[in-house]
């Protein structure tokens, strides 16, 4: 769930890395209330995920490795 490009809450689903093309990180500030990882999916959706959850960290790590290889 997001509003004005801010994540307001986290998804309650687990996504597969095959579904994700990239991510951006949201840091809590005066505009956005929470830290979040915003996953960008192959369907053009943006999904707000909790950066503390293991499955989120795993995908971020996997995508970061891919980016570093390029």
């Amino acid at each position: 769930a997001s509003n004005f490009d801010c994540c307001l809450r986290y998804t309650d689903r687990i996504l597969h890395p095959k579904f994700i093309v990239g991510f951006t990180q949201q840091l809590a500030n005066e505009t956005c209330d929470i830290n979040a990882v915003i996953f960008h999916t192959k369907k053009g959706l943006s999904v707000c995920a909790n950066p503390k959850q293991t499955w989120v960290k795993l995908i971020v790590r996997r995508l970061s490795k891919k980016i570093n290889k390029m």
Partner: antibody, heavy 120, light 107 residues
Framework: QVQLVQSGAEVKKPGASVKVSCKAS????????MHWVRQAPGQGLEWMGV????????TYAQKFQGRVTMTVDTSTSTVYMELSSLRSEDTAVYYC?????????????WGQGTLVTVSS | DIQMTQSPSSLSASVGDRVTITCGAS??????LNWYQRKPGKAPKLLIY???NLADGVPSRFSGSGSGRDYTLTISSLQPEDFATYYC?????????FGQGTKLEIK
């Protein structure tokens, strides 16, 4: 070797709750998810939900939301699945299964199953 | 939720036959699909992960193919121990829905 050992069969009355345990051994417990899947008589496999033992994160199938609770005890490498407000349709074999994100999020090892019978 | 539809729901075949089971997803699941075998009274067993990869210890007569919405499990030469029920499963996004199963029986 990897082993998932589940608790024994249960008979419950409608409206009661049941708590099934699944004790893991032979691998690093917190490195893999644990799923719960059930199979009712004459029916197919039904995914109920998953717990990540490393952070206790859970996500449940909508059908079971509010009735199922999955918990973990890392000190004993055991996962628990509690299902409340039981009805006759909950009569099934309940399986725990290790979720391995290294093999495409597949369930690569399964417990032996626990038969839960709901009957008045 | 993503729906998974298997066909046929049951199938009679003989030892040595080549058998194909299909699984269709209600939307593109990008190869995030696994296949399991279940025999009566036993726990399910992983056969294929990631649509095409053979799980450890699974005989090479089993193979998986497909992409997008359509996937196939093939047994190249049926053995007596292969008579069982087979399930596909979506793992793209929770809930991880299963197909309704295909029961493979001896002709």
């Amino acid at each position: 070797q990897v082993q998932l050992v589940q608790s024994g069969a249960e008979v419950k009355k409608p409206g009661a709750s049941v708590k099934v345990s699944c004790k893991a051994s032979g691998y690093t417990f917190t490195n893999y998810w644990m799923h719960w899947v059930r199979q009712a008589p004459g029916q197919g496999l039904e995914w109920m939900g998953v717990i990540d033992p490393s952070d206790s994160y859970t996500t449940y199938a909508q059908k079971f939301q509010g009735r199922v609770t999955m918990t973990v005890d890392t000190s004993t490498s055991t996962v628990y699945m509690e299902l409340s407000s039981l009805r006759s349709e909950d009569t099934a074999v309940y399986y725990c299964a290790r979720g391995n994100y290294g093999v495409d999020y597949a369930m690569d090892y399964w417990g032996q199953g626990t038969l839960v019978t709901v009957s008045s | 939720d993503i729906q998974m539809t298997q066909s046929p729901s049951s199938l009679s075949a003989s030892v040595g036959d080549r058998v194909t089971i299909t699984c269709g997803a209600s939307e593109n699941i990008y190869g995030a699909l696994n296949w399991y075998q279940r025999k009566p009274g036993k726990a399910p067993k992983l056969l294929i992960y990631g649509a095409t990869n053979l799980a450890d210890g699974v005989p090479s007569r089993f193979s998986g193919s497909g992409s997008g919405r359509d996937y196939t499990l093939t047994i190249s030469s049926l053995q007596p121990e292969d008579f069982a029920t087979y399930y596909c499963q979506n793992v793209l996004i929770t809930p991880y829905t299963f197909g309704q199963g295909t029961k493979l029986e001896i002709k």
